[in-house]
């Protein structure tokens, strides 16, 4: 009989319900923005904005300072007071729309929904390892700003993204704001602008460059700015916007906008459509060619990648890659595929595609009918003409005007749909050793830390844990402070180590020591932990074998039993080859001789299931007693595997030595032709792994085996005669003298 060890699901080696408590701060209101600062003298801070208040936290998330940022018109508003005696505009709550660092000074800049979206500059004052905010400077010059021309109106109540870039002796604010007709009419924020912060911090320089959604499109064409970042020579904005100015405004897609970070100009403003898809390995009937589109970007982050992912993406290690989490629609509702997918766009490739798009538009021969695009920002035109013009004039250049690149950049889900029902709401990517890890927050308040790798059919988790009990969504913006990431959920800020919150969710020694080196996991006798959790017995170099099951559960006291042991950490080599003398199995007092692996029985095990099998031949010693006993596997002197060596003993109860007894055989005669159905009755007849009924030395074919009964069909007899009948269990004869009489047919 060919018994096989039951497969253990890979998930059984970890427990994602393990509770981890990470440092947190209660902000007293829904967290609206968060940013971190690390100085060059070991001072650091976390700035957390809620409605009408700005908190300054130390690196330990303890409150250092708190500043009232609203309501506007309230005498207690500390930022408002910096603008001198009011009134400065309609009273109302201040929701923080922008919270960024100007690292050159260094200073914190906060901009709110009140007071025409003006900003405040807070110089940073290091105090030991903490940081305080100096009295705020109001970045607003009343006599410089009018409703139709307001360089100091930065934040839109509908949302604003800002990236600060230092150019020469100045800080430039790259600002992208969502607009509608009402917002645009009130102190005229722009869709995209580059504003220089004046050296005296009195506001922003006038006459700044900007693009804005044209008034006729403001009602129907809204752009959501999801993320902004600066890398290399460019600043990038990521948007979700209608795919067309003229078609259904609810048909959305994602774009990347690129601006020069070295020149405060918008002539080389470029947009590129980002296309992220889920392409299952086996395509369902009716599924779209090229995969199911996930057009709406939810969150994004750019980071340099580790060696392994770089190889898979065919780029160099350390190159910057834009990662985006995409959903099928605004509500991110369930579709056929997963709820969220993750696509990777190497920055160099993005830049190349954009540059090629510019060549297509501006280098002859230009494809007839190729549009410059961005008709929501500028007058329609065909390449190579400038916006709104029929032809290029001699003193203008095709390249000096904004352009939508005519091709899109298409990518497929890195996780092959494995995120399944998870709705990702936050993303931050880090490189740890040569591994690239995605730290994701979810709609139900969990953190998933997963290796970014595309060649697998399962997720490689660093961790998967709940941030707290509230189950509120993790917010979009994530900040890094040293070796920690700061996530916000509801009114709380949580500090999560980038190496993961701990190791207790790994349940087996093998899984524990196979964890990434950066996690610092080790085995502490019976649990996985970090060294500080169990200094006594903590080690990272070996695991004992682990017996989970064996078969059979009983064997004859005389005769041999082929014992199959199941578990993990038997070999550490896929071939399952065992060096001589390393594995010792005893059952009770009796040795069990290791058997060579039958290569014909080796079969591939999918990585998401795992089990190891070990076979041995059990021959009880003469001194072995009947009754229950233990199975013990000891492994010593094994050569080390990739992650650890196997060393130690595992013991499992539940084996019994039994003595089979044959009590009755009937009928005691039958035709010489054979085929008589013999019934053998007794006790413990099914023990062990082999048994044979011999009629005159020839095997009687077993039809049924149970503990108390064997059924077999007699073989043909040579002559009419009484012949010996015997029962062997495990190759040893069961006591008793029985005969069977062959008669004429």
């Amino acid at each position: 009989e060919d018994w096989q060890c039951p497969r253990t699901p890979y998930a059984a080696s970890r427990d994602f319900d393990v509770k981890y408590v990470v440092p947190s701060f209660s902000a007293g209101g829904l967290v609206q923005a968060m940013v971190t600062y690390e100085g060059d003298r070991n001072e650091s801070a976390v700035f957390v904005a809620i409605r009408n208040r700005l908190h300054v936290l130390g690196p330990d998330l303890k409150s250092v300072q708190s500043l009232a940022t609203g309501p506007a018109g309230d005498p207690g508003c500390q930022t408002c007071a910096a603008c001198g005696p009011g009134p400065h505009g309609p009273p109302g709550d201040t929701d923080t729309k922008v919270l960024v660092l100007d690292p050159a000074l260094p200073a914190l800049v906060s901009c709110g929904s009140s007071l025409q979206g003006r900003c405040f500059l807070h110089d940073l004052e290091p105090q030991g390892t903490a940081v305080h905010l100096a009295a705020p400077a109001c970045l607003f010059s009343a006599h410089h700003n009018r409703p139709d021309d307001c360089p100091d109106c930065v934040a839109s109540p509908l949302g604003t993204r800002v990236t600060v870039v230092e150019q020469g002796q100045a800080s430039y604010f790259y600002v992208a704001s969502s607009l509608d007709a009402a917002v645009a009419a009130s102190f005229s924020p722009r869709s995209v602008s580059i504003r220089r912060l004046k050296a005296d911090a009195s506001g922003f320089a006038p006459g700044f460059v900007a693009l804005s959604v044209l008034p006729k499109h403001l009602v129907s064409y809204s752009i959501e700015y999801v993320h902004s970042f600066h890398t290399g020579a460019f600043v990038y904005f990521l948007t979700v916007q209608p795919a067309s100015v003229t078609d259904d405004p609810s048909a959305l897609h994602t774009r990347l906008a690129r601006l020069s970070a070295t020149e405060p100009e918008l002539g080389d403003y470029r947009e590129l459509v980002l296309d992220c898809r889920f392409a299952p390995k086996r395509r369902r009937r009716g599924a779209p060619e090229g995969g199911q589109p996930y057009p709406v970007l939810r969150v994004a982050h750019s980071a340099p990648v580790g060696a392994q992912l770089a190889t898979e993406l065919s780029i160099a290690e350390g190159q910057e890659v834009l990662f985006g989490v995409f959903v099928t629609g605004k509500d991110g509702g369930p579709g056929v595929g997963p709820n969220s997918v993750v696509c990777a766009f190497p920055i160099d490739l993005l830049d190349t595609l954009i540059d090629e798009g510019v060549e297509r538009c501006c280098e002859s021969p230009v494809h007839p009918g190729l549009r410059r695009g961005l008709d929501f920002f500028q007058s329609p035109s065909f390449c190579p003409n400038p916006p709104g013009l029929e032809a290029l004039s001699p003193n203008t250049s095709c390249r000096h005007f904004p352009l939508l690149v005519s091709s899109s950049f298409s990518r497929v889900d890195l996780f092959n749909g494995l995120l399944g029902p998870v709705q990702v709401t936050a993303l931050y990517v880090t490189r740890l050793d040569n591994v690239t890890v995605a730290h994701m927050g979810t709609m139900d308040g969990r953190i998933l830390q997963v290796e970014l790798v595309r060649s697998l059919n399962y997720l490689l988790y660093v961790s998967n844990f709940s941030l707290g009990d509230s189950g509120q969504p993790v917010q979009r913006d994530v900040s890094r402070l040293g070796d920690h990431l700061l996530f916000a959920s509801g009114d709380q800020v949580f500090q999560v180590p980038i190496q993961g919150p701990g190791c207790r969710h790994f349940l087996t020694c093998g899984r524990c020591l196979r964890a990434w080196h950066f996690m610092g996991c080790g085995w502490c006798g019976n649990m996985c932990g970090q060294q500080k959790e169990c200094p006594g017995s903590w080690q990272q170099d070996h695991c004992p074998p682990k017996l989970t099951e064996f078969h059979p559960h009983s064997g004859p006291l005389r005769g041999s039993t082929r014992l199959t042991l199941c578990g993990s950490n038997f070999y550490l080599h896929p071939s399952g080859l065992v060096p001589e003398g390393t594995h010792q199995v005893t059952v009770g007092q009796s040795p069990c001789r290791p058997l060579p692996k039958d290569s014909s029985k080796l079969r591939p095990v999918p990585r998401k299931d795992f089990v190891e099998e070990f076979e041995c031949e059990l021959e009880p010693l003469g001194t072995q007693a009947v009754g229950p006993t233990n199975v013990s596997l000891t492994v010593t002197n094994m050569p080390p595997g990739k992650h650890f060596r196997v060393d130690g003993t595992s013991v499992l109860r539940g084996f019994s030595f039994m003595e089979p007894v044959l009590i009755a055989v009937q009928p005691l005669f039958g035709p010489r032709a054979g085929g008589t159905c013999l019934t053998l009755e007794g006790q413990s007849l099914s023990v062990g792994t082999s048994r044979a009924v011999l009629v005159n030395g020839t095997e009687c074919l077993l039809a049924r085996v149970s503990e108390g009964q064997l059924l077999c069909a007699t073989p043909p007899g040579a002559t009419v005669a009484s012949v010996p009948l015997s029962l062997q269990v495990g190759g040893a004869q069961v006591p008793g003298s029985w005969t069977f009489q062959y008669r004429e047919d």
Epitope: L105, A199, A205, G207
Partner: antibody
Amino acid sequence: EVQLQQSGPELEKPGASVMISCKASGYSFTGYNMNWVKQSTGKSLEWIGDIDPYYDGTRYNQKFKGKATLTADKSSSTAYMQLKSLTSEDSAVYYCTREGRGFAYWGQGTLVTVSA
Amino acid sequence: DIQMTQSPASLSASVGETVTITCRASENIYSYLAWYQQKQGKSPQLLVYNAKTLAGGVPSRFSGSGSGTQFSLKINSLQPEDFGSYYCQHYYGTPLTFGAGTKLELK
């Protein structure tokens, strides 16, 4: 390339007025304040004031209020400083310099000599 | 007004030496401080801004440090072209003020 070209040296009698010019090129003139700085022979530097060419807004060091008047002509990208009621104390090199966190761009300086 | 006190007023040094010039503000100016070099008959040249950021084209032997009220400019391995006058200046509000200067001479 950012350049600030100042007018040539001036020899004036006490009580007279003088107008110094500073022509800017290589950048958006209205996007930056223009500052003026005085340096007397063998002495340190003194900030006189600045002008915002976009709005024509001016700020002065209290010490130079009534002495200096700053103006700007957007059409020619030129900033001007007029010094009134000159005395020997006003003899100095006067520099225009473009706003920034630190003054990275300076004119070559205009020497004003007040002598009877 | 914020006063900027610079020391020493003059300094003699040899090529290859390291020198440090200090500047003290009468009140907290955070990092809103610039350093300039001026040669005889020339316009000042920006060396350092934001207290410690080197301006474009300035050799790395120059370095600025400090914040709040105490600042310094350090020149490692003096070169012949480094001799001249040095000024600190704050730009934290108006009026902007300069230090009285340090004259660095060849010993």
